[in-house]
C-alpha cells in the first residue's frame, strides 16, 4: 500500500526533514507550510493548524517561499540617472539601472545604487575600452598616424587619410589636409555606422602625444567624427 | 612609435612561478592599455588578461584568473606578467601588446617564450 | 565565451591571386572585430580593427567586411609577403577571444 501523504501541519520523523515548500516550526514542532512568494505569514502554525497566509501590501514584496512575519519594502524610486527595469510588484523588489551614457559605480544585490555618466575621450584620445553597465569608459590616446577630432565616449581614433601631396599633416586630433589632388581611402566609402552604446564623464585630461609631424603615410577615412567604439567588452 | 621589447627565455618546473617583463619606449605606459596573449606550439593565440597602467586596474580571462597576476611600473614603462602553478601546457610564447585609442592591439611585444619542464 | 571559426584552416592561394578568409563568430559581436597577420618566428600585427577599418600603413590590398556574426578578409592581388597566418579577434565581450588561424600558402 501507498504511504500516507501527511497534511500540514504534521510531526516529522525523528532525523526527517520537512518537504518543500514547508518549513519546521521550533514552537509547534511540527512541519508546517511555507507562504508563497507574494504572501507573508499571517499567523504562525500550531500542533492543530497550519500557517496563515495574507497578501503583501502595496510597496512590499517576498520573492521566495517563505515563513515571515511581514513583506519587505520595496526599495526607493529610482533616481534621475536611472531606468526602472524591474517595477515593485508583490513579487518582486524594483530594479533600477543606469540610464545610457551612464555607468554602474557602486552596485547593490540587484540593480544600481550609484550610477556615474560615462567619461568622454577628448580630441587626440579615442575609446580604448568602451563603457559597459558596470564600468567606465577607458580614454587613450591616438597611436601614430592615427587620430580621433571629436569629444565622445564611443569614438575611436582613425587612420590618417595618405595624400599624394600634403598641405597640411596631420596629428593626433586632425586628419591630415591634402592638396587638391584626390586621396584614397583606407575603406569602404562612406564612415563606419556603428549602433550608439551608452554614453558621457569629465574628459580625459591628460597631454595628447603629438605623432610625428613628418607628411602622414596612412590611409584616409572619410572626414567627420570616428566611428564608435560600438559594443562594449562586457565585465 | 611605439616599441614593446620583453624580456628573455625562460625554463621553469612544474608548480615553479614565471615573470615576464614587457619595457615600453617611444611613448608613455600610461597611454596604452597593456594585455598578455599566450600562444601554445603549433597554437592559436589566447588572451590572459589586460592592465590599465594609469589607473592600476586589472582584467583577466577567466583561464587564467586564478594563476596570473599583470602588474605595471609607470617610473620605469615596464609592464609585468606573473603566471604562477606552472604545468607543461602553460610552455608557450607570451606576448605583451599594446592598446592605444584605436581599440585594437596596436604593437606587440617580440614573444618570451617560457618552456615548462621537469 | 564567444567562439571565432575560421575558415578554411588552411587556404593554397597562387600569387597575383585573390584571397579570401572567413570568420563566424558564435555570437553577435557587432563590429568588434580585428584581423591580425602573423609570420613565422614573429609577432602578430594588425591589418584591419573594427571589422573594416585598415590601419595606418597596411596597403589598400588589405580589405575586411562583415558585421554581426560573418567577418571577412580579403587580400586583393596576393604578394609573396602576404603569405602567412592570420587570426580574426572579437572584443565585444570578455573573454577576448581569437579564431584558430587560417594559414595562407603558396599554391
Known amino acids: 500500500l501507498p504511504a500516507q501523504v501527511a497534511f500540514t501541519p504534521y510531526a516529522p520523523e525523528p532525523g526527517s526533514t520537512c518537504r518543500l515548500r514547508e518549513y519546521y516550526d521550533q514552537t509547534a514542532q511540527m512541519c508546517c507550510s511555507k507562504c508563497s512568494p507574494g504572501q507573508h505569514a499571517k499567523v504562525f502554525c500550531t500542533k492543530t493548524s497550519d500557517t496563515v497566509c495574507d497578501s503583501c501590501e502595496d510597496s512590499t514584496y517576498t520573492q521566495l517561499w517563505n515563513w515571515v512575519p511581514e513583506c519587505l519594502s520595496c526599495g526607493s524610486r529610482c533616481s534621475s540617472d536611472q531606468v526602472e527595469t524591474q517595477a515593485c510588484t508583490r513579487e518582486q523588489n524594483r530594479i533600477c539601472t543606469c540610464r545610457p551614457g551612464w555607468y554602474c559605480a557602486l552596485s547593490k544585490q540587484e540593480g544600481c545604487r550609484l550610477c556615474a555618466p560615462l567619461r568622454k575621450c577628448r580630441p587626440g584620445f579615442g575609446v580604448a575600452r568602451p563603457g559597459t553597465e558596470t564600468s567606465d569608459v577607458v580614454c587613450k590616446p591616438c597611436a601614430p598616424g592615427t587620430f580621433s577630432n571629436t569629444t565622445s565616449s564611443t569614438d575611436i581614433c582613425r587612420p590618417h587619410q595618405i595624400c599624394n601631396v600634403v598641405a597640411i599633416p596631420g596629428n593626433a586630433s586632425m586628419d591630415a589636409v591634402c592638396t587638391s589632388t584626390s586621396p584614397t581611402r583606407s575603406m569602404a566609402p562612406g564612415a563606419v555606422h556603428l549602433p550608439q552604446p551608452v554614453s558621457t564623464r569629465s574628459q580625459h585630461t591628460q597631454p595628447t602625444p603629438e605623432p610625428s609631424t613628418a607628411p602622414s603615410t596612412s590611409f584616409l577615412l572619410p572626414m567627420g567624427p570616428s566611428p564608435p567604439a560600438e559594443g562594449s567588452t562586457g565585465d | 612609435e611605439v616599441q614593446l621589447v620583453q624580456s628573455g627565455a625562460e625554463v621553469k618546473k612544474p608548480g615553479a612561478t614565471v615573470k615576464i617583463s614587457c619595457k615600453v619606449s617611444?611613448?608613455?605606459?600610461?597611454?596604452?592599455?597593456l594585455h598578455w596573449v599566450q600562444q601554445a606550439p603549433g597554437k592559436g593565440l589566447e588572451w590572459m588578461g589586460w592592465?590599465?597602467?594609469?589607473?592600476?586596474?586589472?582584467k583577466y580571462g577567466q583561464k587564467f584568473q586564478s594563476r596570473v597576476t599583470i602588474t605595471a611600473d609607470t617610473s620605469t614603462d615596464t609592464a609585468y606578467m606573473e603566471l604562477s602553478s606552472l604545468r607543461s601546457e602553460d610552455t608557450a610564447v607570451y606576448y605583451c601588446?599594446?592598446?592605444?585609442?584605436?581599440?585594437?592591439?596596436?604593437?606587440w611585444g617580440q614573444g618570451t617564450l617560457v618552456t615548462v619542464s621537469s | 565565451d564567444i567562439v571565432m571559426t575560421q575558415s578554411p584552416a588552411t587556404l593554397s592561394v597562387s600569387p597575383g591571386e585573390r584571397a579570401t578568409l572567413s570568420c563566424k563568430a558564435s555570437q553577435n559581436v557587432g563590429s568588434n572585430v580585428d584581423w591580425y597577420q602573423q609570420k613565422p618566428g614573429q609577432s602578430p600585427r594588425v591589418l584591419i580593427y573594427k571589422a573594416s577599418i585598415r590601419y595606418t600603413g597596411i596597403p589598400a590590398r588589405f580589405s575586411g567586411s562583415g558585421s554581426g556574426t560573418e567577418f571577412t578578409l580579403t587580400i586583393s592581388i596576393l604578394q609573396s609577403e602576404d603569405f602567412a597566418v592570420y587570426f580574426c579577434?572579437?572584443?565585444?565581450?570578455?573573454?577576448?577571444?581569437f579564431g584558430q588561424g587560417t594559414k595562407l600558402e603558396i599554391k
Open positions: 579577434m572579437q572584443s565585444k565581450s570578455y573573454p577576448i577571444t
Open positions: 601588446a599594446a592598446q592605444s585609442g584605436t581599440g585594437t592591439m596596436d604593437a
Open positions: 592592465i590599465d597602467p594609469e589607473e592600476g586596474k586589472t
Open positions: 617611444g611613448y608613455s605606459i600610461t597611454d596604452y592599455l
